[in-house]
Interface confidence: medium
């Protein structure tokens, strides 16, 4: 005999919620695998200038994305299948996974906050190396794409550490079109914008993390309520 009333509502709510979660995980995993194997993005991730490699942050970033996608699919499947099958075992495993993920999120949040300066430094280093490659090997379209993405996303151009040769190239080729390049080069320093992103805009990342944490707590409560509902209904 299946669950009834309010518990049945929770069952389908949990199913829909986790189906979306599973789908999102699939998209993240798909995108991450595509990024990992696409030649253009592989070149960006493995940007080199001489013997200098792009920071490990980006190399590791893809694998973190793959892991996140896989875990989301797995947890989503447990929630979906556990809810629809009314399996206490699957729902219990789902609850345990959520607790572990919640702990991981808290740990990641603390680590990110503590290491935000190092992450910002890595991002700046990545920008500098992409910029160097775009100048030295102007056939490196991936490097140019990275530089232009930085410039357009952060609305900046160059940095105060530039050499004259790089400045020449930026002025003529890589700065956002329609911008006052001269003032942009010196006022809209990309290094400064990256620092601002990791200090001034940190609250946005915090809000996103809190939203995810609330959803996880909400799912934990639903899975526990459903689990108890299944146990109670099996008694009768």
């Amino acid at each position: 005999m299946g669950v009834e009333g309010c518990t049945k509502c929770i069952k389908y709510l949990l199913f829909v919620f986790n189906f979306i979660f599973w789908l999102a995980g699939g998209i993240i995993l798909g995108v991450a695998l595509w990024l990992r194997h696409d030649s253009q993005t592989t070149n960006i991730l493995y940007l080199q200038l001489g013997d200098k490699q792009a920071p490990n942050t980006f190399y590791v970033g893809i694998y973190i994305l793959i892991a996140v996608g896989a875990v989301m699919m797995f947890v989503g499947f447990l929630g979906c299948y556990g809810a629809i099958q009314e399996s206490q075992c699957l729902l219990g495993t789902f609850f345990t996974c959520l607790v572990i993920l919640f702990a991981c999120e808290v740990a990641a949040g603390i680590w990110g906050f503590v290491n935000k300066d190092q992450i910002a430094k890595d991002v700046k280093q990545f920008y500098d190396q992409a910029l160097q490659q775009a100048v030295v090997d102007d056939d490196a379209n991936n490097a140019k794409a990275v530089v232009k993405t930085f410039h357009e996303t952060l609305d900046c151009c160059g940095s105060s550490t530039l050499t004259a040769l790089t400045t020449s190239v930026l002025k003529n080729n890589l700065c956002p079109s329609g911008s006052n390049i001269i003032s942009n080069l010196f006022k809209e320093d990309c290094h400064q914008k990256i620092d601002d992103l990791f200090s001034g805009k940190l609250y946005l990342i915090g809000i996103a993390a809190i939203v995810v944490a609330v959803i996880m707590i909400f799912e934990m409560i639903l899975s526990m309520v459903l689990c108890c509902g299944i146990r109670n209904s099996s008694v009768y």
Epitope: Q132, V135, D138, D139, T163, A164, L165, V169, N172
Partner: antibody, heavy 123, light 110 residues
Framework: EVQLLESGGGLVQPGGSLRLSCAAS????????MSWVRQVPGKGLEWVSS????????YYADSVKGRFTISRDNSKNTLYLQMNSLRAEDTAVYYC????????????????WGQGTLVTVSS | QSVLTQPPSASGTPGQRVTISCSGS????????VNWYQQLPGTAPKLLIY???NRPSGVPDRFSGSKSGTTASLAISGLRSEDEADYYC??????????FGGGTKLTVLG
């Protein structure tokens, strides 16, 4: 041996055109920025133009802008300078040179030079 | 008129130490590295010093470069007769691109 060899110089009338070539040997032209520099006999060096490894970035001295065109054919390991609307003041020995770029994109000068080709603009 | 100023001539006797200066502004020499060239009579220029003070392979250590503020210097110690040549300083300026100094004619006396 790393070498650059210019050709195409000669006598031309004012308003005329000339195309200089610079053949590279001993290195892959496509890996380097290249430049043209000229020198009026008995005078100093004057930079004319620079071109990046795949022709994305091109720069000219104000004195030749709109009249001269720098280009390259990496498959032929050759650099070119198309000179139009020539004037008497363009008379000089034209050198092609390889540009050296260091770490952090520092311009480290012109490290390989050709022997030069004389261009004389006279009626 | 070159934006990098060099003395038109310099001289010294064999074995002596000679210094050639190159002065510019904060926008060219002040914020960029300087390169030096030697042009022996009837030949193409040759890169002598790059990045303020580095010597390409094959250049004797008698030649040294330095830069302080908006002035760069090329020093030649133990002067030899074969050092008689024209010497040029050069920088890449973000506005005027490659900029050469007017050149200094070095004469080895006696």
């Amino acid at each position: 041996e790393v070498q650059l060899l210019e050709s195409g110089g000669g006598l031309v009338q004012p308003g005329g055109s000339l195309r200089l070539s610079c053949a590279a040997s001993g290195f892959t032209l496509g890996s380097y920025w290249m430049s043209w520099v000229r020198q009026v006999p008995g005078k100093g060096l004057e930079w004319v133009s620079s071109i990046s490894s795949s022709s994305s970035y091109i720069y000219y001295a104000d004195s030749v802008k709109g009249r001269f065109t720098i280009s390259r054919d990496n498959s032929k390991n050759t650099l070119y300078l198309q000179m139009n609307s020539l004037r008497a003041e363009d008379t000089a020995v034209y050198y092609c040179a390889r540009q050296r770029i260091g770490d952090l994109v520092v311009h480290y000068g012109l490290d390989v030079w050709g022997q030069g080709t004389l261009v004389t603009v006279s009626s | 008129q070159s934006v990098l100023t060099q003395p038109p001539s310099a001289s010294g006797t064999p074995g002596q130490r000679v210094t050639i200066s190159c002065s510019g502004s904060s926008s060219n020499l002040g914020s960029n590295t300087v390169n030096w060239y030697q042009q022996l009579p009837g030949t193409a220029p040759k890169l002598l010093i790059y990045g303020n003070s580095n010597r390409p392979s094959g250049v004797p250590d008698r030649f040294s470069g330095s830069k302080s503020g908006t002035t760069a210097s090329l020093a030649i110690s133990g002067l030899r007769s074969e050092d008689e040549a024209d010497y040029y300083c050069e920088v890449w300026d973000s506005d005027s691109y490659v900029t050469f100094g007017g050149g200094t004619k070095l004469t080895v006396l006696g």
